[in-house]
C-alpha cells in the first residue's frame, strides 16, 4: 500500500491489498476502500464504467464479465486500484468486437482474459489462415493484444484472440480490423472543362472530380474573391478500399452577365490541399471575331497560287461560311475546320486556295461567316503581278509613234533610238506624252500606259524601240526606218520579248 | 453499458439550422465511430454521416453532403449533428448510433424529433 | 453508392409461424451486412451482424446467413415481441445503406 510523509493527503487504502486478484465464477467479490474522505469506487472494462458509492464493493455470485480494473477515489482526487480477474473455463475472453486501426498507428484488439494464467496468449488469423508475416503484437491480459504499426494491407483481415487452455487452443469470437488510411497525398482534383462560355439565360454546370483514399476528403466549390456558398450536386463511388470518387457538380440554372467569373473546385485532407478552377464567360449574345493570317492587300504573280487564310472566334458555333469572287461563291478549293478539338474551342480557321493565278483573277475575294446571332465578313485585295504586254504600236497620221502596254504594277514606257544597224539601242528618246488610261476589264486588273514620241526627230536610217517594263518583266516593240530620199518609210514594226 | 443520450426535440422554421447533441455515457468515446440517421414519418432509415474513430474529417452520404455537420467533443464524449438550411422534408426522428465506419450500429441513442414548418 | 433491396415491404404472419426476409444488394457486400428490428416508436436494436452473427442478448430464434449479395434473416418461430419493422443495411465501405424495410404484422 501506498505511503506518504504526514500531513499531505494520501491515496485511499484497498482490501485486499494486492494489485491483481483471481476468484472463480460464482465466488463472492468483497473489496473494502479505506479512507476517511471516500468518495466512490469505478470499475472499468473495455468500453464500460460503473461507479459505486458504498466504501465496500460487494459482489455476491461473481461472472466473467466482473474481470476488469476497480479504483477507489477518495475527495482529494487521488486513488488506488485493484485489478480483478474472475475465471471462468467457459469464457476465456471478454470481447469487444468493435476494432479499428489507424494506418501506421497501434491499435488494440480488445479481448482482455478472464484467466492470467492460461498460455500463449496471441492473435490467429480466422479459418486456419496465417497472419501477414509482417504483423506484430503485444499481449496484455489485462486489455488485450495491441497491433503495432497498422498496415493498409491489414483492412478487413479477419482475428481471433487465442489462448492454450490445459494443451488445447481456444479462440475468442471474430474480429475484423478496419484500417483507417493515413492521408499521404494531396487529394486529386480535376475539373471537366478548364474555361466555359455561354450567353446570359443558358445553363453552366460543371463537375470537380475528387479522388482520394478515404470518403473523408472535404472539397468545396468556391467562387473567387466571394464567400458566397455555392449550390453542388454530389456523386461518388468506392472503386475498392482506400481509391474513392466524388463528383461535386456546380450548376448556375439561367447564367447571368455577372456571374462570369473564376470558380475553384478546392479539396483537402490531413496531409494538404489542391485545387482546380475553370473560369465561367457570360455575353449577352453571341460573337464573330475575324483575324485574317496574311494582309487583307494581296499581291501574287502571274500563274503563282496564294491561300487567303483567315482565322475566327465564333459564338454560338458558326452555321454558314462561304468564299465570294465577283458575286459568285466557291464551291470547292476552300476549307474551314476548327482550330483545335478542344471541346471548349470557338476558334475556327477558314482557307482559300487560288491556284495558278490569271491576270483577270484579280479583285475582292469576301469571306462570310454566320451563326444564329451574328454576321461577319472580311475582304481581301488580290492584285495579280503580270508582265507587260504591248498591246498596239503604230505610226500615227500626225507623225507620232506610240505604244499602248497593260501590265501589273503600272508598267513603265521607255523609247531608245539605234542607229543604222547597230544592234544595241542605247541613246534614249524622251516621250512627248504619257497616259495612264482607264481598264475596260475589272478592278485590280491590269493598267494600261499610252506614251508616244514624235518620228520627226529621227533624220536617220535606224531602229525605234518602245520598252515596256515592271516588277514582273519586260516587253519591247520595234520600229525600223529606211530613207529614200527625202522620203521616211516604216518598214513592218516587230516585237521582240526580253526575260 | 455504454448509453447515448441525445438531446431534446426541436422545431425549426424552414431555412435555418438544427444543432442535435449525443453524449456518450457508461464508456470511453474515441475509439468508436459515431454515425447518425434519421427516420422521416413512416420512411425508413437514412444514413447521413460517420464521425471518427480517430480524428480526422466526418464523411456524410452525398445527399446531405454539403449541408449536414458532423462534429465530436471527445472531453465531454459528446458528438454533434447541425443540419443547415432546413426544409420541411427534413422533418424527422435523428438518431446517434456507435458504429459506421465499415461496421454496424450495435447502440442507438433515443432520437430526437426535429420538426420543420413555418 | 450500393442499393440494398429488401423484400417482401411487409408480411402477416401469425405466432409459432417460421418467417424469412431477403435482402439484395446491387454489387456484392461479401458479409458486411447487419439486420436490425425496431418497433414504433423506438430505435431499431441489433439483431445480426457480419451477415451471421447474432447480437449478444438477441434471442437464438432470430438468425442470419447469405454472403455476396443475397442474404436472408429467418425467425424460425415468430413470437408475439417480435411483430416489428425489419431493416437490413450494408457497411462494406464508409457510405452506409439501409433497405427500405419489412413490416411483420399479425395475421
Known amino acids: 500500500q501506498p505511503s506518504v510523509s504526514p500531513g499531505e493527503p494520501s491515496p485511499p487504502s484497498i482490501h485486499p491489498g494486492k494489485s491483481d486478484l483471481i476468484v472463480r465464477v460464482g465466488d463472492e467479490i468483497r473489496l473494502l476502500c479505506t479512507d476517511p474522505g471516500f468518495v466512490k469506487w469505478t470499475f472499468e472494462i473495455l468500453d464500460e464504467t460503473n461507479e459505486n458509492k458504498q466504501n465496500e464493493w460487494i459482489t455476491e455470485k461473481a461472472e466473467a464479465t466482473n474481470t476488469g480494473k476497480y479504483t477507489c477515489t477518495n475527495k482529494h482526487g487521488l486513488s488506488n486500484s485493484i485489478y480483478v480477474f474472475v475465471r471462468d473455463p467457459a469464457k476465456l475472453f471478454l470481447v469487444d468486437r468493435s476494432l479499428y486501426g489507424k494506418e501506421d498507428n497501434d491499435t488494440l484488439v480488445r479481448c482482455p482474459l478472464t484467466d492470467p494464467e492460461v498460455t500463449n496468449y496471441s492473435l490467429k488469423g480466422c479459418q486456419g489462415k496465417p497472419l501477414p508475416k509482417d504483423l506484430r503484437f503485444i499481449p496484455d491480459p489485462k486489455a488485450g493484444i495491441m497491433i503495432k504499426s497498422v498496415k493498409r494491407a491489414y483492412h478487413r483481415l479477419c482475428l481471433h484472440c487465442s489462448v492454450d487452455q490445459e494443451g488445447k487452443s481456444v479462440l475468442s469470437e471474430k474480429f475484423i480490423l478496419k484500417v483507417r488510411p493515413a492521408f499521404k497525398a494531396v487529394p486529386v482534383v480535376s475539373v471537366s472543362k478548364a474555361s466555359y462560355l455561354l450567353r446570359e439565360g443558358e445553363e453552366f454546370t460543371v463537375t470537380c472530380t475528387i479522388k482520394d483514399v478515404s470518403s473523408s476528403v472535404y472539397s468545396t466549390w468556391k467562387r473567387e474573391n466571394s464567400q458566397t456558398k455555392l449550390q453542388e450536386k454530389y456523386n461518388s463511388w468506392h472503386h475498392g478500399d482506400f481509391n474513392y470518387e466524388r463528383q461535386a457538380t456546380l450548376t448556375i440554372s439561367s447564367a447571368r452577365v455577372n456571374d462570369s467569373g473564376v470558380f475553384m473546385c478546392y479539396a483537402n485532407n490531413t496531409f494538404g490541399s489542391a485545387n482546380v478552377t475553370t473560369t465561367l464567360e457570360v455575353v449577352d449574345k453571341g460573337f464573330i471575331n475575324i483575324f485574317p493570317m496574311i494582309n487583307t492587300t494581296v499581291f501574287v504573280n502571274d500563274g503563282e497560287n496564294v491561300d487567303l487564310i483567315v482565322e475566327y472566334e465564333a459564338f454560338p458555333k458558326p452555321e454558314h461560311q462561304q468564299w465570294i469572287y465577283m458575286n459568285r461563291t466557291f464551291t470547292d478549293k476552300w476549307e474551314d475546320y476548327p482550330k483545335s478539338e478542344n471541346e471548349s474551342n470557338i476558334r475556327y480557321v477558314s482557307e482559300l486556295h487560288l491556284t495558278r493565278l490569271k491576270g483577270t483573277e484579280g479583285g475582292t475575294y469576301t469571306f462570310l461567316v454566320s451563326n444564329s446571332d451574328v454576321n461577319a465578313a472580311i475582304a481581301f485585295n488580290v492584285y495579280v503581278n503580270t508582265k507587260p504586254e504591248i498591246l498596239t504600236y503604230d505610226r500615227l497620221v500626225n507623225g507620232m509613234l506610240q505604244c499602248v502596254a497593260a501590265g501589273f504594277p503600272e508598267p513603265t514606257i521607255d523609247w531608245y533610238f539605234c542607229p543604222g544597224t547597230e544592234q544595241r539601242c542605247s541613246a534614249s528618246v524622251l516621250p512627248v506624252d504619257v497616259q495612264t488610261l482607264n481598264s475596260s476589264g475589272p478592278p485590280f486588273g491590269k493598267l494600261v500606259v499610252q506614251s508616244s514620241i514624235d518620228s520627226s526627230a529621227f533624220k536617220h536610217n535606224g531602229t525605234v524601240e518602245c520598252k515596256a517594263y515592271n516588277d514582273v518583266g519586260k516587253t519591247s516593240a520595234y520600229f525600223n526606218f529606211a530613207f529614200k530620199g527625202n522620203n521616211k518609210e516604216q518598214i513592218h514594226p516587230h516585237t521582240l520579248f526580253t526575260p | 453499458q455504454v448509453q447515448l443520450v441525445q438531446s431534446g426535440a426541436e422545431v425549426k422554421k424552414p431555412g435555418s439550422s438544427v444543432k442535435v447533441s449525443c453524449k456518450a455515457s457508461g464508456g470511453t468515446f474515441s475509439s468508436y465511430a459515431i454515425s447518425w440517421v434519421r427516420q422521416a414519418p413512416g420512411q425508413g432509415l437514412e444514413w447521413m454521416g460517420t464521425?471518427?474513430?480517430?480524428?480526422?474529417?466526418?464523411r456524410y452520404a452525398q445527399k446531405f453532403q454539403g449541408r449536414v455537420t458532423i462534429t465530436a467533443d471527445e472531453s465531454t464524449s459528446t458528438a454533434y449533428m447541425e443540419l443547415s438550411s432546413l426544409r420541411s422534408e427534413d422533418t424527422a426522428v435523428y438518431y446517434c448510433?456507435?458504429?459506421?465506419?465499415?461496421?454496424?450500429?450495435?447502440?442507438w441513442g433515443q432520437g430526437t424529433l426535429v420538426t420543420v414548418s413555418s | 453508392d450500393i442499393q440494398m433491396t429488401q423484400s417482401p415491404s411487409s408480411l402477416s404472419a401469425s405466432v409459432g409461424d417460421r418467417v424469412t426476409i431477403t435482402c439484395r444488394a446491387s454489387q456484392s457486400i461479401s458479409n458486411y451486412l447487419a439486420w436490425y428490428q425496431q418497433k414504433p416508436g423506438k430505435a431499431p436494436k441489433l439483431l445480426i451482424y457480419d451477415a451471421s452473427s447474432l447480437q449478444s442478448g438477441v434471442p437464438s430464434r432470430f438468425s442470419g446467413s447469405g454472403s455476396g449479395t443475397d442474404f436472408t434473416l429467418t425467425i424460425s418461430s415468430l413470437q408475439p415481441e417480435d411483430f416489428a419493422t425489419y431493416y437490413c443495411?450494408?457497411?462494406?465501405?464508409?457510405?452506409?445503406?439501409f433497405g427500405q424495410g419489412t413490416k411483420v404484422e399479425i395475421k
Open positions: 448510433a456507435r458504429g459506421g465506419y465499415i461496421s454496424d450500429f450495435d447502440v
Open positions: 464521425i471518427g474513430p480517430f480524428e480526422g474529417q466526418p
Open positions: 443495411q450494408q457497411y462494406y465501405y464508409e457510405s452506409i445503406t
